[in-house]
């Protein structure tokens, strides 16, 4: 580990001397000196600085940008930002979440895996054999096939990933 | 009144290490940040490092951290600073100094002379 | 590492005479900035700390101004007795550093 410098925790060191950092919250005025303590004053309306520092200015909150599709998760405090989410049945297109694009459907032959939420997309998978899928869905997963035995009927038409058996009824000429 | 006395003056071989003491009185020991400074002949000042007494931390100048170990007794109100590896180059005064707001009282400084 | 440069490197005036420094940073420094009086044979003295507070004790024919990089000594009416090496010093980044110095010497 590094070790210890001349100022301890929540301080910094500025004109040979440790001042205290401004708590999350609030921003620095004025630094210490040798008679006077750090000055501090509470973020506004609207900003935030999440960590103990000796910043002049305060951060603005974020705004979630209902034209890009964004609504607001969390409200920010003084000590925290704003969360942007996106829209029902839209995704973050970043980890930042700046804007949102619709969800992606899984075409014919695909399924849905996992659904689509705020910050990621739909992901898709290929139906496997005996599964299928003949719509562009954003939820729908890999239907089973149809079993024919189960309902007394035979397999007239094989299955595809895009679409289901057909079923007929058995050759009554057969013992 | 502030007071800072130093050690005295050393002649050092190249390839030995030097040890400079600093008294402090006439303040709490703890409460201020210890500053060390040097000049060589004829020369400007040079920042070496500052030791914090109260709590042991320190920081030093990039240039001289691998040899340079700055210490504090608080029970003697004294502050220490040790170079080692000497070289020719390393022959100047050292000075140490109280912080708070600046190099706010200085040393009477420590000549140090490396010569073979 | 934020230089610093000291101008001049050293001037000659009359006792009365109004000398002025100046120091100039690399970067922004804001008002970090200290000025000192180096006596050959005595110990480094602080004139002025945060660019313009003069430390106590020290003759109120001493000031100093100026904030972000540029910034400027002042002795109103020289003296005999002020016949020194001054030099200028950051406190906003470590490492700390020192302009080259002015020599102030007497006509």
């Known amino acids: 580990p590094e070790p210890p410098t001349a100022c301890r925790e929540k301080q910094y060191l500025i004109n040979s001397q440790c001042c205290s950092l401004c708590q999350p919250g609030q921003k620095l005025v004025s630094d210490c000196t040798e008679f006077t303590e750090t000055e501090c004053l509470p973020c506004g309306e609207s900003e935030f600085l999440d960590t103990w520092n000796r910043e002049t200015h305060c951060h603005q909150h974020k705004y979630c940008d209902p034209n890009l599709g964004l609504r607001v998760q969390q409200k920010g405090t003084s000590e925290t930002d704003t969360i942007c989410t996106c829209e029902e049945g839209w995704h973050c297109t970043s980890e930042a979440c700046e804007s949102c694009v619709l969800h992606r459907s899984c075409s014919p032959g695909f399924g849905v895996k996992q659904i689509a939420t705020g910050v990621s997309d739909t992901i898709c998978e290929p139906c496997p054999v005996g599964f299928f899928s003949n719509v562009s869905s954003a939820f729908e997963k890999c239907h089973p096939w149809t079993s024919c035995e189960t309902k007394d009927l035979v397999v007239q038409q094989a299955g595809t990933n895009k679409t289901d058996v057909v079923c007929g009824p058995q050759d009554r000429l057969r013992a | 009144q502030v007071q800072l006395v130093q050690s005295g003056a050393e002649v050092k071989k190249p390839g030995s290490s030097v040890k400079v003491s600093c008294k402090a009185s006439?303040?709490?020991?703890?409460?201020?940040?210890i500053e060390w400074v040097r000049q060589a002949p004829g020369q400007g000042l040079e920042w070496i490092g500052v030791i914090n007494p109260g709590s042991g931390g320190s920081n030093y100048n990039e240039k001289i951290k691998d040899r340079a170990t700055l210490t504090a007794d608080k029970s003697t109100s004294t502050a220490y600073m040790e170079l080692s590896s000497l070289r020719s180059e390393d022959t100047a005064v050292y000075y140490c100094?109280?912080?708070?707001?600046?190099?706010?009282?200085w040393g009477q400084g420590t000549l140090v002379t490396v010569s073979s | 590492d934020i230089q610093l440069t000291q101008s001049p490197s050293s001037l000659s005036a009359s006792v009365g005479d109004r000398v002025t420094i100046t120091c100039r940073a690399s970067?922004?420094?804001?008002?970090?900035l200290n000025w000192y009086q180096q006596k050959p044979g005595k110990t480094i003295k602080l004139l002025l700390n945060f660019a313009s507070r003069l430390h106590s004790g020290v003759p109120s024919r001493f000031s100093g101004s100026g904030s972000g990089t540029d910034f400027t000594f002042t002795i109103s009416s020289l003296q005999p007795e002020d016949i020194a090496t001054y030099y200028c010093q950051q406190g906003s980044t470590l490492p700390w550093t020192f302009g080259g110095g002015t020599k102030v010497e007497i006509k």
């Open positions: 006439g303040y709490a020991f703890s409460d201020y940040l």
């Open positions: 970067q922004d420094i804001s008002n970090y």
């Open positions: 100094a109280r912080g708070g707001g600046g190099f706010t009282y």
